[in-house]
Interface confidence: medium
């Protein structure tokens, strides 16, 4: 797995540094988890033939993965930076069941898969430290979040790979919306 | 091969519109960032819109906003601006271009060749 | 909004010189930097992005440095084709700003 952010060899060896702010720390947090998105996306396109398939609308329907839309916005018409917060929040709390279910979807990657999923819970922190609005932020109910998994994984094996790739390419989309949205704050 | 056909330049009168069109080839629009900039004659370069594939949505320059807008269409491959209530200072070459899509450390990795568009009366 | 401020605004050089062009940011962009050449009538090409990483194909006599406010491109032999107009640009955050350019041509 990647190093963490904040603990590469050029951090290590220039301790003069200034310390990096909460909005650069948020910053190099998703990119380091779009990093790991890359490689986990790399193992699912080199194994199957998911990433070309035109049936993902198919599958998509089944799956309820959070999107940007104009109404959180995030976008620079309507941009709202505290709606845009909550949005990016409450998404990134969404898609941690998906990302419990990617823990056992990957043989060469596993440990990057973890590493996506515990990085995740850091950029949550970081996050709600900024948000000034937590009431408005919804948890997702685990009681629903353990039955999804249970169906999810019982899927065949088909249905199993288009789902990693699903998720992941949804994951990646948020990331890098959310990315930019945040640079506008 | 990848590159980025643009069409639509021309002179106009101020006040005037123009539709500028852009249509790639060798990679799909709709899974790549798309961006205008423009240079007005002896300048330098100014970005002036762009638009991320994921959910469509679009930044613009304060300069252009609420005059220009940027579009796509997926069938077609093709980005394009609108640009409506243009100005003397909107005459440039217009360059559509595609940002690498490397969510890192992004840059501009494919250019069109530029169409001249020039507001006069 | 970001500014970029270039210097020096035009540069003149013989084949063979080794030279600096220098990009200064208004505030931090760690290594959020590109930079660009532009020769008369042609569209730009990138030459680096993420302030020191050379795009493939572009000569290795093209090297870039610098993280935060401070970046500098240096050519280190001049090529005859190396002659053109140089532009830094943030790719941070919506305005994408760039430099107003560094023309280099023949002392």
């Known amino acids: 797995a990647p190093v963490p952010p904040g603990e590469d060899s050029k951090d290590v060896a220039a301790p003069h540094r200034q310390p990096l702010t909460s909005s650069e720390r948020i910053d190099k947090q998703i990119r380091y988890i779009l990093d790991g998105i890359s490689a986990l996306r790399k193992e699912t396109c080199n194994k199957s033939n998911m990433c070309e398939s035109s049936k993902e609308a198919l599958a998509e329907n089944n799956l309820n993965l959070p999107k940007m839309a104009e109404k959180d916005g995030c976008f620079q018409s309507g941009f709202n930076e505290e709606t845009c917060l909550v949005k990016i929040i409450t998404g990134l709390l969404e898609f941690e069941v998906y990302l419990e279910y990617l823990q056992n979807r990957f043989e060469s990657s596993e440990e990057q898969a973890r590493a996506v999923q515990m990085s995740t819970k850091v950029l949550i922190q970081f996050l709600q430290k900024k948000a000034k609005n937590l009431d408005a932020i919804t948890t997702p109910d685990p009681t629903t979040n353990a039955s999804l998994l249970t169906k999810l994984q019982a899927q065949n094996q088909w249905l199993q790979d288009m789902t990693t790739h699903l998720i992941l390419r949804s994951f990646k989309e948020f990331l890098q919306s959310s990315l930019r949205a945040l640079r506008q704050m | 091969e990848v590159q980025l056909v643009q069409s639509g330049g021309g002179l106009i009168q101020p006040g005037g519109s123009l539709r500028l069109s852009c249509a790639a080839s060798?990679?799909?629009?709709?899974?790549?960032?798309m961006i205008w900039v423009r240079q007005a004659p002896g300048k330098g370069l100014e970005w002036v819109s762009d638009?991320?594939?994921?959910?469509?949505?679009?930044y613009y320059a304060d300069s252009v906003k609420g005059r220009f807008t940027m579009s796509r269409d997926i069938s077609k491959n093709t980005v394009y601006l609108q640009m409506n209530s243009l100005r003397a200072e909107d005459t440039g070459v217009y360059y559509c271009?595609?940002?690498?899509?490397?969510?890192?450390?992004?840059?501009?990795?494919?250019w069109g060749r530029g169409t001249l568009v020039t507001v006069s009366s | 909004d970001i500014v970029m401020t270039q210097s020096p605004s035009t540069l003149s050089a013989s084949v063979g010189d080794r030279v600096t062009i220098t990009c200064r940011a208004s505030?931090?962009?760690?290594?959020?930097l590109a930079w660009y050449q532009q020769k008369p009538g042609r569209a730009p090409k990138v030459l680096i992005y993420?302030?020191?990483t050379l795009e493939s194909g572009v000569p290795s006599r093209f090297s870039g440095s610098g993280s935060g406010t401070d970046f500098t491109l240096t050519i280190s032999s001049l090529q005859p084709e190396d002659f053109a107009t140089y532009y830094c640009?943030?790719?941070?955050?919506?305005?994408?700003?760039f430099g107003q350019g560094t023309k280099l041509e023949i002392k």
């Open positions: 271009a595609r940002w690498a899509d490397d969510h890192n450390y992004p840059h501009i990795d494919v």
């Open positions: 640009a943030a790719h941070y955050a919506a305005p994408w700003t």
């Open positions: 993420k302030a020191s």
């Open positions: 638009l991320y594939y994921y959910a469509g949505d679009t």
């Open positions: 505030q931090g962009i760690s290594s959020w």
């Open positions: 060798g990679f799909t629009i709709s899974s790549n960032y």
